[in-house]
């Protein structure tokens, strides 16, 4: 389970994203971002410093629209 406001790295980060985002899937950098994919992403925000559940959820993919 997710413990708020702590650093999440490596496998823990991936596992937590899978738990939080579920079937939606997730990104390591927000798709809307125009900056380099490595410049600022979830690794920097959650592993290099601590992050919370709200921030984690911003990296979840948008669910596909059903026809």
């Amino acid at each position: 389970a997710y413990r708020p406001s702590e650093t999440l790295c490596g496998g823990e980060l991936v596992d937590t994203l899978q738990f939080v985002c579920g079937d939606r899937g997730f990104y390591f950098s927000r798709p809307a971002s125009r900056v380099s994919r490595r410049s600022r992403g979830i690794v920097e925000e959650c592993c290099f410093r601590s992050c919370d559940l709200a921030l984690l959820e911003t990296y979840c993919a948008t669910p596909a629209k059903s026809e």
């Epitope: 823990e12 596992d15 390591f28 920097e44």
Partner: antibody, heavy 121, light 107 residues
């Protein structure tokens, strides 16, 4: 092909600092995280920290916090690791290692040749 | 920090043998385990990541398995170039930590 070339061996006195460089080639420097790992003579491997060559942000192992500084120069595709307040226990081979994963998983697919740092009075 | 314990610390084997190396984590790490091979005076080489995924270019005689706290590296049909030291490493959380190594020696 991917190559990580480190600077040469160093001999330092206790209390001094050392700065080791690692020049990358054969790939897009800013697209892969870089780690530093050390190995004392005849001993195992010890992770020191990670740097994002794109933004320059870093994360260090608690053990080295306050003594280690990792930086990068994108113009020369080089990362640096500086260790201060050296003691005899810091005698080791220092490796830079590239992370193969976008999630900074610590999967080191390419390594530098290693830099031997000897700390002796 | 997660402690990684390898066994045995050394093993003597002959060319053609099957060698099994075990790695235990002090807490569950799912499948976030890596195996490296290191020869004297050289940098380590990535063999297996995510417990069982073979790194590109690594011979198929190497295989990894396990999850949770217990992991295994198997070398089938041991070749002369396989005599080396093998390290496991957890990639579940920082600090990343390594096992103490297993030296595979010629019998």
């Amino acid at each position: 092909q991917v190559q990580l070339v480190e600077s040469g061996a160093e001999v330092k006195k206790p209390g001094a600092s050392v700065k080791v460089s690692c020049k990358a080639s054969g790939y897009t420097f800013t697209s892969y995280y870089m780690h530093w790992v050390r190995q004392a003579p005849g001993q195992g491997l010890e992770w020191m920290g990670i740097i994002n060559p794109s933004g320059g942000s870093t994360s260090y192992a608690q053990k080295f916090q306050g003594r280690v500084t990792m930086t990068r120069d994108t113009s020369t595709s080089t990362v640096y690791m500086e260790l201060s307040s050296l003691r005899s226990e810091d005698t080791a081979v220092y490796y830079c290692a590239r992370d193969r994963s976008i999630a900074a998983m610590g999967w080191f697919d390419h390594w530098g040749q290693g830099t031997l740092v000897t700390v002796s009075s | 920090d997660i402690q990684m314990t390898q066994s045995p610390s050394s093993v003597s084997a002959s060319v053609g043998d099957r060698v099994t190396i075990t790695c235990r984590a002090s807490q569950g790490i799912s499948s976030w385990l890596v195996w490296y091979q290191q020869k004297p005076g050289k940098a380590p080489k990535l063999l297996i990541y995510a417990a069982s995924r073979l790194q590109s270019g690594v011979p198929s005689r190497f295989s990894g398995s396990g999850s949770g706290t217990l992991f295994t590296l198997i070398i089938n049909n041991l070749q002369p170039e396989d005599f080396a030291t093998y390290y496991c490493q957890q990639s579940n959380s920082v600090p990343l930590t390594f096992g103490g190594g297993t030296k595979v020696e010629i019998k």
